[in-house]
Interface confidence: medium
C-alpha cells in the first residue's frame, strides 16, 4: 500500500495511492462486480428456495456455495475496495480482524464447497450403485456443516487471537492483514492448504470423472441399440434401494389398470412406498417409468434378444413379495446425481425367480423407453457433466492461481511483486464468487427459467418451473 505524504502537516498523511480518475474507475468496476456477485448468488438461493424442483441434494451444495459467495460479494469485496482506494485501513483493528476472519473463513468455505461438489460428482460416477443410497439430505447437511465448521476452526481463532498468543499486535492501525502472514513461509503454507491441495484434489477427481465418462461412452457406442436414444447413449444401472417387507400387493394383484402414458406411468401407492426414501429430483427432460413390474403380467414377460441386457442386483430377502422397478432416463444437469442415463432401481424381489424376472422386466422397459434415432444427437450427458466440472475447475484455477503463484514467488523474492499486482491477484480470488453462479446454475435449464421468472417478476407458477 503506497502511502504518499502530505508535507503541509507534521503527521504522516495516509492518502490514496491512486489518482481521482483511477479511484472512480476502481470503485465502478469493483462496485459492479460486487453487485453482480450479490444478484447472482441471491438468484441461486431464492431459486432453490422457491422452486421445489430445485430442492435436490446437489443444489443444497450450491445453496451453501451461494451463501459463501454472497458474503464475499457483500462484505469482502466492498471492504477491500475501500482499503485499496483509500490506501489505508480506516475502520480500526477490531473491524480489521473481523473482516479478515470473515474473508478467509468464507473464502475457504467456498473452496470446500467446490471440493464437496467435486467429490459428490466423483462418487456419482464411480459408485453409481452404492453412493446414491447414502446421498441423503441429512448427509448433504452434515457435509455442508463440516465445510463451514472446519473453515471456521482453521482460520477464525488464528486471525482473531494470534496477537494474544504472541503477546503483541504488530499490525498498525492504518494496516489490515493477518498478523502471522509476516512470515513468507507461513503464508506459503496456508496457500498450499487453501489452494494447491484443493486444486490437486479437484484435478485428480476431474481426471477420474472424465475417464469414467469416456469409458462409459465407449461402452455405449459398442451397443447398437443404445444409440437409438436421441438424448444420449443409454446406460442401464440396476440397484437395490430397500427391500420392502410390508404385505403389499404382489406384481399381479390387479394393478394392470395403470397404463403407461407417454413413457410415464402414473404413481400408485406401491410406487410411492418404494421410492419414499429417494431424493426429490427434478425430472427435467426425463423419461421415467415407475412400477412397471406391477403393471406387467407374468405372461407378458418374455425374453427379448433385441434389448439391452442388464445385470441387476437382487434382494437377499426371499420372502419379500414386492418387486418395484423404477427406470428413468434422467438429465443430470447440476441437480441430479447419476450421470448415467437410464437408471433401473429394483426394490425387493418376487420369490425365487426374482432375479430372472427382474432382468426380463428391465429389458422390456429399456426397449419401451427408447425413442426413434435422430440424425445428429446432442452431446451426451456424460460429456455435459464432465464439461461442467471442467468449467468449475478452470474457473477456480484461473481466479485463484495468480494470487497463489505470487505467494509462491514471494517466498523466494519479497519485493518482486508490485502492490497493484497483489491487489489484482487478491481481487481475482473474489471474482471466483462472481463466476460460481454462472458456472453451476446456468448449466441447468430449470435454474435458467427460474432466474428469468424472478428477474421478470413472474411469480405465478415459479414453484413448479421445470
Amino acid at each position: 500500500m503506497n502511502n504518499s505524504t502530505n508535507s503541509s502537516n507534521n503527521s504522516l498523511a495516509l492518502t490514496s495511492p491512486y489518482k481521482t480518475f483511477e479511484v472512480v474507475f476502481i470503485v465502478l468496476v469493483a462496485g459492479s462486480l460486487s453487485l453482480v456477485t450479490i444478484i447472482g448468488n441471491i438468484l441461486v438461493m431464492v431459486s432453490i428456495k422457491v422452486n421445489r424442483h430445485l430442492q435436490t441434494v446437489n443444489n443444497y451444495f450450491l445453496f451453501s456455495l451461494a451463501c459463501a459467495d454472497l458474503i464475499i460479494g457483500v462484505f469482502s469485496m466492498n471492504l477491500y475496495t475501500l482499503y485499496t482506494v483509500i490506501g489505508y485501513w480506516p475502520l480500526g483493528p477490531v473491524v480489521c480482524d473481523l473482516w479478515l476472519a470473515l474473508d478467509y473463513v468464507v473464502s475457504n468455505a467456498s473452496v470446500m464447497n467446490l471440493l464437496i461438489i467435486s467429490f459428490d460428482r466423483y462418487f456419482c460416477v464411480t459408485k453409481p450403485l452404492t453412493y446414491p443410497v447414502k446421498r441423503t439430505t441429512k448427509m448433504a447437511g452434515m457435509m455442508i456443516a463440516a465445510a463451514w465448521v472446519l473453515s471456521f476452526i482453521l482460520w477464525a481463532p488464528a486471525i482473531l487471537f494470534w496477537q494474544f498468543i504472541v503477546g503483541v499486535r504488530t499490525v498498525e492501525d492504518g494496516e489490515c492483514y493477518i498478523q502471522f502472514f509476516s512470515n513468507a513461509a507461513v503464508t506459503f503454507g496456508t496457500a498450499i492448504a487453501a489452494f494447491y491441495l484443493p486444486v490437486i484434489i479437484m484435478t485428480v477427481l476431474y481426471w477420474h470423472i472424465s475417464r469414467a465418462s469416456k469409458s462409459r461412452i465407449k461402452k455405449d457406442k459398442k451397443e447398437p441399440v443404445a444409440n437409438q436414444d436421441p438424448v444420449s447413449p443409454s446406460l442401464v444401472q440396476g440397484r437395490i434401494v430397500k427391500p420392502n417387507n410390508n404385505n403389499m400387493p404382489s406384481s399381479d394383484d390387479g394393478l394392470e389398470h395403470n397404463k403407461i402414458q407417454n413413457g410415464k406411468a402414473p404413481r400408485d401407492p406401491v410406487t410411492e412406498n418404494c421410492v419414499q426414501g429417494e431424493e426429490k429430483e427434478s425430472s427435467n427432460d426425463s423419461t421415467s417409468v415407475s412400477a412397471v413390474a406391477s403393471n406387467m403380467r407374468d405372461d407378458e414377460i418374455t425374453q427379448d434378444e433385441n434389448t439391452v441386457s442388464t445385470s441387476l442386483g437382487h434382494s437377499k430377502d426371499e420372502n419379500s413379495k414386492q418387486t418395484c422397478i423404477r427406470i428413468g432416463t434422467k438429465t443430470p444437469k447440476s441437480d441430479s446425481c447419476t450421470p448415467t442415463n437410464t437408471t433401473v432401481e429394483v426394490v425387493g424381489s418376487s420369490g425365487q425367480n426374482g432375479d430372472e424376472k427382474q432382468n426380463i422386466v428391465a429389458r422390456k422397459i429399456v426397449k419401451m423407453t427408447k425413442q426413434p434415432a435422430k440424425k445428429k444427437p446432442p452431446p451426451s450427458r456424460e460429456k455435459k457433466v464432465t464439461r461442467t466440472i471442467l468449467a468449475i475447475l478452470l474457473a477456480f484455477i484461473i481466479t485463484w492461481a495468480p494470487y497463489n503463484v505470487m505467494v509462491l514467488i514471494n517466498t523466494f523474492c519479497a519485493p518482486c511483486i508490485p502492490n497493484t499486482v497483489w491487489t489484482i491477484g487478491y481481487w481475482l480470488c473474489y471474482i471466483n464468487s462472481t463466476i460460481n453462479p454462472a458456472c453451476y446454475a446456468l448449466c441447468n435449464a430449470t435454474f435458467k427459467k427460474t432466474f428469468k421468472h424472478l428477474l421478470m417478476c413472474h411469480y405465478k407458477n415459479i414453484g413448479a418451473t421445470r
Epitope: N3, T170, E172, I417, N419, W422
Partner: nanobody
C-alpha cells in the same frame, strides 16, 4: 496511525557533519526496513541510504558512499543518518522512509514530513 518524525537538520558548512534522526511511532519497529531519501531544489527525490529490519544489511547511493552511515536502534524505534564531509550538493530536504513488506499484501510504505539540510560553501 504510523508516524515518522525527522530531526537533526540545519545549516552546516562544507566539510562539516550532521546527524539526522527519525523516530517512528509504530508497534513493532523491527518489522520495518528504514531508509533516507532526499530532494534537492528543482530535483527529483533520490535514494540516499537504507537499512534492513535487523540492521545487518545496509545500502548507500554512490554519491554518499564512505561519507554517510545509516544505523538503527530498535529499542528506541529510531533510525539515524550520520553525515560526514558534507558538500554543497548535499543540500536538500531529507525524508525518512519506513517500509514493511507483508506477504500476500505487498508493501506498506510510510514517509516522514522531511527535515531541511543546507550545506554552505
Amino acid at each position: 496511525q504510523v508516524q515518522l518524525q525527522e530531526s537533526g537538520g540545519g545549516l552546516v558548512q562544507a566539510g562539516g557533519s550532521l546527524r539526522l534522526s527519525c523516530t517512528a511511532s509504530v508497534r513493532t519497529f523491527s518489522n520495518y526496513g528504514m531508509g533516507w531519501f532526499r530532494q534537492g531544489p528543482g530535483k527529483e527525490r533520490e535514494f540516499v541510504a537504507s537499512i534492513s529490519w535487523s540492521g545487518t544489511m545496509t545500502q548507500y547511493a554512490d554519491s554518499v558512499k564512505g561519507r554517510f552511515t545509516i544505523s538503527r536502534d530498535n529499542a528506541k524505534s529510531t533510525v539515524y543518518l550520520q553525515m560526514n564531509n558534507l558538500k554543497p550538493e548535499d543540500t536538500a530536504v531529507y525524508y525518512c522512509n519506513a517500509v514493511k513488506y507483508i506477504p500476500g499484501r505487498g508493501e506498506y510504505d510510510y514517509w516522514g514530513q522531511g527535515t531541511q539540510v543546507t550545506v554552505s560553501s
